[in-house]
Interface confidence: medium
């Protein structure tokens, strides 16, 4: 239904607290360099304006679209051009082009320092003094670093953050209570960020149809007892919600997400038997719970997939009459039978089925032609299964850090032109798949591994797109989203790469490494490892092991020395010389 004032409508639906949080996220995602204080001033102005519109929907400017209102606010910021350069050019455009222009200037890798968590005592003091401001800073800092973070989900994580601080700040050992709990929230939020970026990439590059196919597969796995029409309705709604959030329509997105949760809870009987526990929760938790819901039990009486899609004489007629619906039912029927497959794999199978029908339905004897299609799925299914098996075995053998290093070597050999920080970030994230997925029951491993890897590789593609340096990466990233992971897996050592000159300064370390937290220490070592591979792309595993072992011993020895600086200064050049020799 149409509302006189869109902003008043959203304010009433969302309530003041969520409204303000979402406006702050929107501004932080658009203008990523602005300080919190500047954004919060704008948020207050927008909120005050929304309240005037709630009081009188006919008040001046209340009929303007939210994009117009937000865009006008952003464009009124003084010194916009000084701080944002060509983003200021967007302000010369009219809506909707202006908003499109803002979206194009979102930076996936903003030049911002890593978010440093304050020391526990200081954190609790500022939280207790002003919880609203503290959580506002959290929203601002996360949103500006992750300009596509799913806004309603970020509100949920802020709520979690609030819960943890409320609980831990009353404890005697605040740090012991806070650290593991906040680490868990951070880990979940970072995974959520890459997953959502993948959804927005899918939407931007391949459109709503591709995203909807993803949603149909995912919903069918989760709700195998729901009718196809019900799954289609849910997938359509989820597609709309994600399109809104990816497009910067955060108020509408959050409002529609709450509506979908309400619908699902009112229609549990026709969706899933597992929803009740979620439906008793408040709105943010309810939506999050529904998004993470376990799969319902598969109905016992499902006929063979072959009956409808291979053996039936009317396959080509049904396909010709309503291609999307027929392929949709295939995807639904296959997905609801296979919660043990990744969504990427299910979409590959649907694509293979579609290609088979396109070819066979144009031939003289279609049934003979498409009769073997299900058997032809076998290699497509085996490939990711083998990937999971070999990688989980390697992870179990090496542990997370060792596995990350193995992945780093592999990916540096595949794409040595990519910047070392990007390779290290990607390898560290890819390497976490072991901890995240390899400990799960067999039936959950494949979907966990492949869908997580796809999201991480999407991040690599997004960063590479900004400054393309590797033809191989460009090739894998330009193709279909579901083929990306197999494409990267199939890459071998880049034979066209001219090895990097050996620069001693790249491998020169100082005593400051000793005081770094473990994570930063690992990153330093992994940076050195990537640089070694760039210098010697064909170095054997043993050679790399020797050099890295030597390096670890060197760091360990010098960090224990009485005169650390002197140790690094004298032992460093010896290490460099030995490394060059070992790799010769």
């Amino acid at each position: 239904e149409a509302h006189k004032s869109e902003i008043a409508h959203r304010f009433k639906d969302l309530g003041e607290q969520h409204f303000k949080g979402l406006v702050l996220i929107a501004f932080s995602q658009y203008l990523q360099k602005c300080p919190y204080e500047e954004h919060i001033k704008l948020v207050q102005e927008v909120t005050d304006f929304a309240k005037t519109c709630v009081a009188d929907e006919n008040a001046e400017n209340c009929d303007k679209s939210i994009h117009t209102l937000f865009g006008d606010k952003l464009c009124a910021i003084p010194k916009l051009r000084d701080n944002y350069g060509e983003l200021a050019d967007c302000c010369a455009k009219q809506e909707p082009e202006r908003n499109e222009c803002f979206l194009q200037h979102k930076d996936d890798n903003p030049n911002l320092p890593p978010f440093q968590r304050p020391e526990a005592e200081a954190m609790c003091t500022s939280f207790q003094e002003n919880p609203t401001s503290f959580l506002g800073h959290y929203l601002h800092e996360v949103a500006r670093r992750h300009p596509y973070f799913y806004a309603p989900e970020l509100l949920y994580y802020a709520e979690k953050y609030n819960e943890v601080l409320t609980q831990c700040c009353t404890e005697s050992d605040k740090a012991a209570c806070l650290t593991p709990k906040l680490d868990a929230v951070k880990e979940k939020a970072l995974v959520a960020a890459v997953r959502q970026r993948m959804k927005c990439s899918s939407m931007q590059r391949f459109g709503e149809r591709a995203f909807k196919a993803w949603a149909v597969a995912r919903m069918s796995q989760r709700f195998p007892n729901a009718e196809f029409a019900e799954i289609t309705k849910l997938a359509t709604d989820v597609t709309k919600i994600n399109k809104e959030c990816c497009h910067g329509d955060l108020l509408e997105c959050a409002d529609d997400r709450a509506e979908l949760a309400k619908y699902m809870c009112e229609n549990q009987a026709t969706i899933s038997s597992k929803l009740q526990a979620c439906c008793d929760k408040p709105v943010l938790q309810k939506s999050q719970c529904l998004a993470e819901i376990e799969h319902d039990n598969i109905p016992a009486d499902l006929p063979s997939i072959a009956a409808d899609f291979v053996e039936d004489k009317e396959v080509c007629k049904n396909y010709a009459e309503a291609k999307d619906v027929f392929l949709g039912t295939f995807l639904y029927e296959y997905s609801r039978r296979h919660p043990d497959y990744s969504v990427s794999l299910l979409l590959r199978l649907a694509k293979k089925y579609e290609a088979t029908l396109e070819k066979c339905c144009a031939e003289g004897d279609p049934p003979a032609c498409y009769g073997t299609v299900l058997a032809e799925f076998q290699p497509l299914v085996e490939e990711p299964k083998n990937l999971v098996k070999t990688n989980c075995e390697l992870y179990e053998k090496l542990g997370e850090y060792g596995f990350q290093n193995a992945v780093l070597v592999r990916y540096t050999q595949k794409a040595p032109q990519v910047s070392t920080p990007t390779l290290v970030e990607a390898a560290r994230n890819l390497g976490r798949v072991g901890t995240k997925c390899c400990t799960l029951p067999e039936a959950q491993r494949l979907p966990c591994v492949e869908d997580y890897l796809s999201a991480i590789l999407n991040r690599l593609c997004v960063l590479h797109e900004k400054t393309p340096v590797s033809e191989k990466v460009t090739k894998c990233c330009s193709g279909s989203l579901v083929e990306r992971r197999p494409c990267f897996s199939a890459l071998t050592v880049d034979e066209t790469y001219v090895p990097k000159e050996f620069k001693a300064e790249t491998f020169t370390f100082h005593s400051d490494i000793c005081t770094l937290p473990d994570k930063e220490k690992q990153i330093k070592k992994q940076t050195a490892l990537a640089e070694l591979v760039k210098h010697k792309p064909k170095a054997t595993e043993d050679q790399l092991k020797t050099v890295m072992g030597d390096f670890a011993q060197f760091v360990d020895k010098c960090c224990k020395a009485a005169d650390k600086d002197n140790c690094f200064a004298t032992e460093g050049p010896n290490l460099v010389a030995r490394s060059k020799e070992a790799l010769a």
Epitope: N225, A226, E227, F228, A229, E230, T232, A269, T270, P299, A300, D301, P303, A307, D308, D312, E314, N318, E321, A322, V325, F326, T329
Partner: nanobody
């Protein structure tokens, strides 16, 4: 707005045949499974037959198995019920309905839109 319009009912002698039709509009017909349900005078509702979106799965109540055939034509947005070897106990108002949820074991079946029904009378 969703509309279902049944036709084809009438008076027929035992052993005779009838073909019921149901014209659907206001929704994407091929997305939905469809059913025929009937209500005999003074009795409750009884489901008769169900058909999947593309017509390749059909289910029948034991009382009509082997005598009735359900079919659909998605290009015409129409559902059919061919009724042969009719008996006096088949006398009822026949409704077509759009399936909202279907559990084959019978635990969960809901229909969200119905037609106004067509009367079938089997009598000599």
């Amino acid at each position: 707005e969703v509309q279902l319009l049944e036709s084809g009912g009438g008076l027929v002698q035992p052993g005779g045949s009838l073909r019921l039709s149901c014209a659907a509009s206001g929704f994407t017909f091929s997305l939905y499974r469809m059913v025929w349900v009937r209500q005999a005078p003074g009795k409750g509702l009884e489901w008769v037959s169900m058909i999947s979106q593309f017509g390749n799965q059909t289910y029948y109540a034991d009382s009509v198995k082997g005598r009735f055939t359900i079919s659909r034509d998605n290009s015409k947005n129409t559902l059919y019920l061919q009724m042969n070897s009719l008996r006096a106990e088949d006398t009822a108002v026949y409704y077509c309905a759009k399936v909202r949820s279907w559990d084959q074991t019978g635990g969960r079946r809901t229909f969200d839109y119905w037609g106004q029904g067509t009367l079938v009378t089997v009598s000599s």
